[in-house]
């Protein structure tokens, strides 16, 4: 014959453990059931009475199977510099991202609490690590031999192109001009591009240096961290 | 060097104000998020506001909303905060804060202090 | 009363390990922010000593490490020094504050 199915509350056999979608409250000393994604627990369980759920208030959500006193609170609405990816449900938190030509300043477990704009890079000096989801663009001087000449977060120093006869020679922040006999080869035939998009933000004026410690893997974002830039100066 | 500076603090009255700067040098001024934190005597740290980089956003502690302003100029590489209807109990030093939100408060002034007191 | 919840001291002799605990709630630690640690020393600013969890910012030993599990936190310190007599405090971000926390601080004596 089949077990005869306990309607909850019920105590449970001495060893064993509660069914899915129920708890063991231990004040009572029964299995109770849990309450449903988007409600809370209202009236906990009792010997005599089961849990009395009720739906989550405004602005408020439960995900999961539970037996919380409160729902939990939706984050803050999402700044301009964000766009909302999930809505804030009685079921579900709000997701906020940055937008494109932006980086998560502030990462959550999910989505992101404060949004900066990917640095530039400003003439005579180069992207030396391009922007994440989670990091920022880090610049770097342009070394001997080599140029750029944009405001970018996406550009890269370029090698001066070689002349037969110098008219002008190249520094960090232009390329070399050769006489009207062109170029023997041009190592620059057009801007090297990074895959990120342009951004709005001023330029540090000298590089970020690495992390001196390895990427955290505390977040569901996909890059590692770049550390906070240290010895810029200001424009 | 990374050096933030603050000044500004002294004896004040309590309803009375008062105007903190923080001269920052060393960075990139305006790519950072900055922040206020006070620390009355003999206790703990305490968040006052926090400005955007480009100053379009301010947030504040509720001990002090409507009575304290954060601003910064980007031009001059300053922050600065406006204390008003000062009470005993914002007696604290002041320390002007870069935040780099993933990475910590990273760089701290040396702090001014604030006396509110008849 | 501080959002995050710290011991008001903790202490050890030279060379033992001491840990100290930053505990949390769904709208800080436990909403995934990251906690960072401070170090102040007497008469001193703050300064940065663990962030995002567990990392070190250049300069910090090894002897300090940091950890992070669903609403709390903690700090190690391994190898006692005198020079490490200070108070530590852990901070976040708080969605409900709308704004970083700091723990109420703990003041770590070295026997």
């Known amino acids: 014959l089949p077990a005869q199915v306990a309607f909850t509350p019920y105590a449970p056999e001495p060893g064993s453990t509660c069914r899915l979608r129920e708890y063991y409250d231990q004040t009572a000393q029964m299995c109770c059931s849990k309450c449903s994604p988007g409600q809370h627990a209202k009236v906990f369980c009792t010997k005599t009475s089961d849990t009395v759920c009720d739906s989550c208030e405004d602005s408020t959500y439960t995900q999961l199977w539970n037996w919380v006193p409160e729902c939990l609170s939706c984050g803050s609405r999402c700044s301009s510099d964000q766009v909302e990816t999930q809505a804030c449900t009685r079921e579900q938190n709000r997701i906020c991202t940055c937008r494109p030509g932006w980086y998560c300043a502030l990462s959550k477990q999910e989505g992101c609490r404060l949004c900066a704009p990917l640095r530039k890079c400003r003439p005579g000096f180069g992207v030396a690590r391009p922007g994440t989801e989670t990091s920022d663009v880090v610049c770097k001087p342009c070394a001997p031999g080599t140029f750029s000449n944009t405001t970018s977060s996406t550009d890269i120093c370029r090698p001066h192109q070689i002349c037969n006869v110098v008219a002008i020679p190249g520094n960090a922040s232009m390329d070399a001009v050769c006489t009207s006999t062109s170029p023997t080869r041009s190592m620059a035939p057009g801007a090297v591009h990074l895959p990120q998009p342009v951004s709005t933000r001023s330029q540090h004026t000298q590089p970020t240096p690495e992390p001196s410690t390895a990427p955290s893997t505390s977040f569901l974002l996909p890059m590692g961290p770049s550390p906070p830039a240290e010895g810029s100066t200001g424009d | 060097e990374v050096q933030l500076l603050e000044s500004g603090g002294g004896l004040v009255q309590p309803g009375g104000s008062l105007r903190l700067s923080c001269a920052a040098s060393g960075f990139t001024f305006s790519d950072y998020y900055m922040s206020w934190i006070r620390q009355a005597p003999g206790k703990g740290l305490e968040w006052v506001a926090l400005?955007?980089?480009?100053?379009?956003?301010?947030y504040y502690a509720d001990s002090v909303k409507g009575r304290f302003t954060i601003s910064r100029d980007n031009s001059k590489n300053t922050l600065y905060l406006q204390m008003n209807s000062l009470r005993a109990e914002d007696t604290a030093v002041y320390y002007c804060v870069r935040e780099t939100g993933n990475y910590g408060m990273d760089v701290w002034g040396q702090g001014t202090l604030v006396t509110v007191s008849s | 009363q501080s959002v995050l919840t710290q011991p008001p001291s903790a202490s050890g002799t030279p060379g033992q390990r001491v840990t100290i605990s930053c505990t949390g709630s769904s709208s800080n630690i436990g909403a995934g922010y990251d906690v960072h640690w401070y170090q102040q020393l007497p008469g001193t600013a703050p300064k940065l000593l663990i962030y995002r969890n567990n990392q070190r910012p250049s300069g910090v030993p090894d002897r300090f490490s940091g950890s992070k599990s669903g609403t709390s936190a903690s700090l190690a310190i391994s190898g006692l020094r005198s020079e490490d007599e200070a108070d530590y405090y852990c901070a976040t971000w708080d969605d409900r504050v709308n704004g970083p926390v700091f723990g109420g601080g703990t003041k770590l004596t070295v026997l």
């Open positions: 400005i955007w980089y480009d100053g379009g956003n301010e």
